[in-house]
């Protein structure tokens, strides 16, 4: 009975040629959308020249699928029983799951304004970003089209700096051709409990974007967990996206297409300030933006973006503390909209639906010698867009999951 | 290749003005912006003037400021420095530089103004 | 106005010397420090940007070091056509400015 059930998973589950497990590893048989809702500023003059709160309109879905790319450069080694891979980033636009096409423009901060006002501030090389500002009349707000946004667009300041810099801008970019890792996982042949936990990435156990436990590499990357999974674990993965290891708590018992699921979620302490879970004191990396140590539901992800402003948050700064949405109007942060979950099926570890969601602000800060930045009279950490990306089983999956899984344990 | 050559220097009396001159070939001046450093005999380096790129802001030394002017000629891709009002204490070997981020990684050869009666 | 403090104002050494020379800031400047060489009669050169950048074409016997206030410039191992006065320079904020100088002579 359930020894031999036991068996069939653990054999199942292991990360190689012929398993159930692998076949979804290598190249998922869920269709994944990223949706994204741009922050589409109303009041850019007011801001620029009288430093008030920041009008902003959500606008959106504008929806891609995603991650329909097989594994790459997909190796065993049979010596420490591990797989490495790379996972191949590409995006299609979906326009009838959209509300607008991908020529449709938003007005957003000047992601190359705010970012080398951030990276460069001495005093110096300012007058001299004023002059390149000023020269191609860039403002401290600009109108891009949601393409240019998202997968870049040349930006008319950074392409007057007289040496060898990268002058594409966009939030993702580069993306598509590009792939993310190179991932090493344990496939499971030894010790079925370590199954697609992540060994090293990029070939480090750690990031070195954090200090102490922070910058540890944990767990798996979120689409599988080792199987036979208790509701009173705490799920521990690595998301590049955020630069960070994170963690999932179980919250309720959910029924997937008929297959029973333990819903997990990313809770508000994960996000919290150190003053109300020490453990998160290494996510606080200066003391000025943070309130020494205070603010909370924001992260500093800039040693991870070359230095650019970059904070990551929950949309609509779901979670944050009140002085970072303070000088932002126009959100409404609600948990069922916009906190990320993850659908497990306990036996096999498998995640069978899944929903990420977060929001990407840049830091943009008062700055003496620029003229578009000169009248701020305090820092903002702007919004420019959230996304969720979804992922579920499909039907034909979700019986065949039925009845050669849960079915036969049930 | 990268070149900048001052002309312009001489003697002059107290008082009396002069205007340097810095042709610039191997780069576009106006992506740059040129700096004036001077260095009086047996002196070290002083900072004097500044035209940052495209045509921006000009900024000068307390010493000189008042007194001198820096401009520049896109379309003769050279710089310029006014002087006037000129005193003892301006002699020296007046040097334009190249720079872009604050460090001067091309220099002219120097051209000497001596102020004396 | 950042003051730029430069130690020694001169120094005599060997061929094959190592050779250290100083620069203090009057106030944090970061890694905006440049170090250059100038010879009698000529026009200074770039050696090292941003405190520790090598400046191309310079021999890798010369590097830079220190971050803030505190400033390095070391020659490993000193040629004859080393001897010559060396500048440090703050590209931080305007005014720049420049040490004194050291003038590195034959011993």
């Known amino acids: 009975g359930d020894l031999l059930i036991q068996k069939t998973i653990k054999k199942q589950v292991v990360l190689e040629e012929g398993t159930i497990a692998f076949k979804n590893w290598v190249k998922t048989g869920t269709e994944v959308y990223r949706q994204f809702w741009i922050f589409d500023v109303q009041n850019p003059q007011e801001v620029m020249m009288n430093s008030s709160n920041i009008q902003v309109k959500q606008r959106g879905p504008y929806t891609y699928r995603v991650r329909f790319l097989a594994k790459e450069n997909v190796t065993q080694d049979a010596e420490d029983n591990t797989v490495s891979f790379l996972q191949p980033n590409g995006a299609i636009f979906e326009p009838s799951l959209s509300v607008g096409t991908e020529a449709d423009n938003f007005t957003v901060l000047n992601l190359a304004v705010a970012a080398a006002s951030h990276i460069y501030q001495n005093q110096f090389v300012q007058m001299i970003l004023n002059s390149l500002i000023n020269k191609s009349k860039s403002s401290m707000f600009q109108v891009r089209t949601l393409r240019e946004l998202l997968w870049g667009y040349r930006d008319p300041f950074l392409s007057l700096v007289p040496y060898p810099v990268t002058t594409t801008v966009g939030l993702f970019y580069p993306y598509n051709n590009t792939a993310d890792g190179v991932y090493k996982v344990f496939n499971g042949k030894d010790n079925i409990s370590k199954v697609a936990i992540i060994d090293t990435y990029k070939g480090k156990r750690n990031l070195s974007y954090w200090e102490s436990h922070c910058d540890m590499i944990n767990g798996t990357d979120a689409a599988s967990f080792p199987p036979f999974v208790e509701k009173s674990q705490v799920l521990q993965f690595f998301s590049s996206d955020i630069c960070r290891s994170i963690y999932a708590v179980f919250e309720s018992d959910v029924n997937l297409k008929g297959i029973p699921v333990y819903r997990f979620v990313l809770p508000s302490k994960a996000f919290a300030s150190p003053v109300e879970n020490p453990d998160n004191y290494c996510f606080c990396t200066e003391k000025i933006i943070s309130k020494n140590c205070t603010s909370y539901g924001v992260l500093d992800i800039s040693k991870c973006k070359e230095g650019r402003p970059v904070y990551i948050s929950l949309p609509h700064f779901l979670y944050a503390s009140p002085d970072v949405s303070e000088p932002i109007d126009g959100l409404n942060p609600n948990e069922e909209e916009h906190r990320t979950y993850l659908d497990i099926e306990p036996i096999t570890g498998f995640t069978l639906q899944f929903a990420k969601r977060l929001q990407v602000n840049l830091l943009v800060k008062p700055s003496e010698k620029i003229q578009v930045l000169k009248n701020l009279k305090r820092n903002y950490i702007v919004p420019i867009l959230w996304l969720n990306e979804t992922g579920t089983i499909g039907d034909e999956k979700a019986n065949m999951f039925r009845s050669q899984v849960t079915g036969k344990i049930n | 290749e990268v070149q900048l050559v001052e002309s312009g220097g001489g003697l002059v009396q107290p008082g009396g003005s002069l205007r340097l001159s810095c042709a610039a070939s191997?780069?576009?001046?106006?992506?740059?912006?040129i700096h004036w450093v001077r260095q009086a005999p047996g002196k070290g380096l002083e900072w004097v003037a500044w035209i940052a790129p495209y045509g921006g802001e000009t900024y000068y030394a307390d010493s000189v400021k008042g007194r001198f002017t820096i401009s520049a000629d896109t379309s003769k891709n050279t710089a310029y420095l006014q002087m006037n009002s000129l005193r003892a204490e301006d002699t020296a070997v007046y040097y334009c530089?190249?720079?872009?981020?604050?460090?001067?990684?091309?220099w002219g050869q120097g051209t000497l103004v001596t102020v004396s009666s | 106005d950042i003051q730029m403090t430069q130690s020694p104002s001169s120094l005599s050494a060997s061929v094959g010397d190592r050779v250290t020379i100083t620069c203090r800031a009057s106030q944090d400047v970061s890694n905006w420090v440049a170090w250059y060489q100038q010879k009698p009669g000529k026009a200074p050169k770039l050696l090292i940007s941003y405190a520790t950048s090598l400046y191309s074409g310079v021999p890798s016997r010369f590097s830079g070091s220190g971050s803030g206030t505190d400033f390095t410039l070391t020659i490993s191992s000193l040629q004859p056509e080393d001897f010559a006065t060396y500048y440090c320079q703050q590209h931080s904020n305007a005014p720049l400015t420049f040490g004194q100088g050291t003038k590195v002579e034959i011993k």
């Open positions: 530089a190249r720079s872009f981020f604050g460090y001067f990684d091309y």
């Open positions: 191997g780069f576009t001046i106006a992506a740059f912006g």
